[in-house]
Interface confidence: low
């Protein structure tokens, strides 16, 4: 692959654990303006597999607030507005990166952490397992 | 709110931009074992609003690989397996944090960036707008 030369203007790393410990500017470059998922779309209500959004807060994590989706039904909403159990509402999950304060309560020292969050729900055809 | 005292074992911050610039340990604590979304579930294929997963790679970003969902159809799959345009397949989007190398090509200096990614698709009842 292409090797990109190191930028001569990079900060020096004086940390013994380098390259595991790096400097991160927390002044976020945000390409998006809307951070409240309830405002950004009403899909959670209009979906055939609707979900509720739960606020998960943790002051030792950055971002401290994460919204978690929980499917409202086991089945999916059919054309008549009823729950159809021939189909299943399932959460769509994604691994995201967060920063965890380490050591705890430190304002300027973090460790990267991967967590699995449910973003919304989708309606799937169930896998029917036949009993042997 | 509760004020948590600063841990006396925290690293000192000698950076003029503190608290914007922090130390981050990239040795990820991963609570999940499966990182390939295609392996983690086959919902993308079984959904009534199926999607394809596209690999988005950027060596200046951490993580360098992100999977983006694109809905396969404008409508949703009905019980007969046909696309039904009385319903709409829509992407479920989420803001995630990534690290962007800053200055570019630096191995040990990053800036936090928020990006919007499509995680999967869900089937929604359309908002039917009457033409004025």
């Amino acid at each position: 692959g292409i090797t990109i030369p190191r930028n001569p203007g990079c900060p020096n790393s004086e940390d013994k654990n380098f390259p595991r410990t790096v400097m991160v500017n927390l002044n976020i470059h945000n390409r998006n303006t809307n951070t409240n998922p309830k405002r950004s779309s009403d899909y959670y209500n209009r979906s055939t597999s609707p979900w509720n959004l739960h606020r998960n807060e943790d002051p030792e994590r950055y971002p401290s607030v994460i919204w978690e989706a929980k499917c409202r039904h086991l089945g999916c909403i059919n054309a008549d507005g009823n729950v159809d159990y021939h189909m299943n509402s399932v959460p769509i999950q994604q691994e995201i990166l967060v920063l965890r304060r380490e050591p705890p309560h430190c304002p300027n020292s973090f460790r990267l952490e991967k967590i699995l969050v449910s973003v919304g729900c989708t309606c799937v055809t169930p896998i029917v397992h036949h009993v042997a | 709110g509760i004020t948590i005292p600063r841990n006396p074992g925290c690293p000192n911050s000698e950076d003029k931009n503190f608290p914007r610039t922090v130390m981050v340990n990239l040795n990820i604590h991963n609570r999940n074992t499966n990182t390939n979304p295609k392996r983690s579930s086959d919902y993308y294929n079984r959904s009534t609003s199926p999607w394809n997963l596209h690999r988005n790679e950027d060596p200046e970003r951490y993580p360098s690989v992100i999977w983006e969902a694109k809905c396969r159809h404008l409508g949703c799959i009905n019980a007969d397996g046909n696309v039904d345009y009385h319903m709409n397949s829509v992407p479920i989007q989420q803001e995630i944090l990534v690290l962007r190398r800053e200055p570019p090509h630096c191995p040990n200096s990053f800036r936090l960036e928020k990006i919007l990614v499509s995680v999967g698709c869900t089937c929604v009842t359309p908002i039917v707008h009457h033409v004025a």
């Epitope: - | 396969r72 404008l74 696309v83 345009y85 709409n88 829509v90 989007q93 919007l116 499509s118 004025a132």
Partner: antibody
Framework: EVQLLESGGGLVQPGGSLRLSCAAS????????MSWVRQAPGKGLEWVSA????????YYADSVKGRFTISRDNSKNTLYLQMNSLRAEDTAVYYC???????????WGQGTMVTVSS | NFMLTQPHSVSESPGKTVTISCTRS????????VQWYQQRPGSAPTIVIF?????PSGVPDRFSGSIDSSSNSASLTISRLKTEDEADYYC?????????FGGGTKLTVL
């Protein structure tokens, strides 16, 4: 009242680029999918591209795939079409349209003329 | 991709009824909505029928749409023709990832 106003058309040489804009008003822009449709002089309508209300899904006609990019800025109520590697056959009036539902162009702008010629 | 085929032109006298057909080359027309657009000379198109047979408010009830699954075709019927109906008419439908217009039919009101 729904209003769609296209701009950015003009004369460009083959291989050149142009960015069309469509300023929308009179409705909640982010709730609607939007499309671009073009019409070559004396010819019929040709669908070019569509984008979902959130901007998360985009679709293109085969004739423009890889050359044109549709995007939207919901904070500015504006739809865009970035056109690169333009060809003579891209010469047309370009209309932006608000979709009733996906692919159903309920309201149209008055169009902007793009001429690709050396 | 599929195609939508329309007659190049049709003509009829004022007060009469005219029907414009639109045939889909492949894929069931019944699975996808059909729209009809009117375009008068020098103007942008306007929708006259959407979702096979739905009429937007402001469009006279002289305009109606239908589909025939057996022939995989759609029709636009305009009754009690008026001179102001003279225009080009386009049918339009979908495939899963794209939108397709018919070639257009020029309606002349004699």
């Amino acid at each position: 009242e729904v209003q769609l106003l296209e701009s950015g058309g003009g004369l460009v040489q083959p291989g050149g680029s142009l960015r069309l804009s469509c300023a929308a008003s009179g409705f909640t822009f982010s709730s609607y999918a939007m499309s671009w449709v073009r019409q070559a002089p004396g010819k019929g309508l040709e669908w070019v591209s569509a984008i979902s209300g959130s901007g998360g899904s985009t679709y293109y006609a085969d004739s423009v795939k890889g050359r044109f990019t549709i995007s939207r800025d919901n904070s500015k109520n504006t739809l865009y079409l970035q056109m690169n590697s333009l060809r003579a056959e891209d010469t047309a009036v370009y209309y932006c349209a608000r979709d009733l539902i996906w692919g159903v162009a309920g309201s149209w702008g008055q169009g902007t003329m793009v001429t690709v010629s050396s | 991709n599929f195609m939508l085929t329309q007659p190049h032109s049709v003509s009829e006298s004022p007060g009469k009824t005219v029907t414009i057909s639109c045939t889909r080359s492949s894929g069931s027309l019944a699975n996808y909505y059909v729209q009809w657009y009117q375009q008068r000379p020098g103007s942008a198109p306007t929708i006259v029928i959407f979702a096979n047979n739905q009429r937007p408010s402001g469009v006279p009830d002289r305009f109606s749409g239908s589909i025939d699954s057996s022939s995989n075709s759609a029709s636009l019927t305009i009754s009690r023709l008026k001179t102001e109906d003279e225009a080009d008419y386009y049918c339009q439908s979908y495939s899963p990832h794209s939108v397709v217009f018919g070639g257009g039919t020029k309606l002349t009101v004699l």
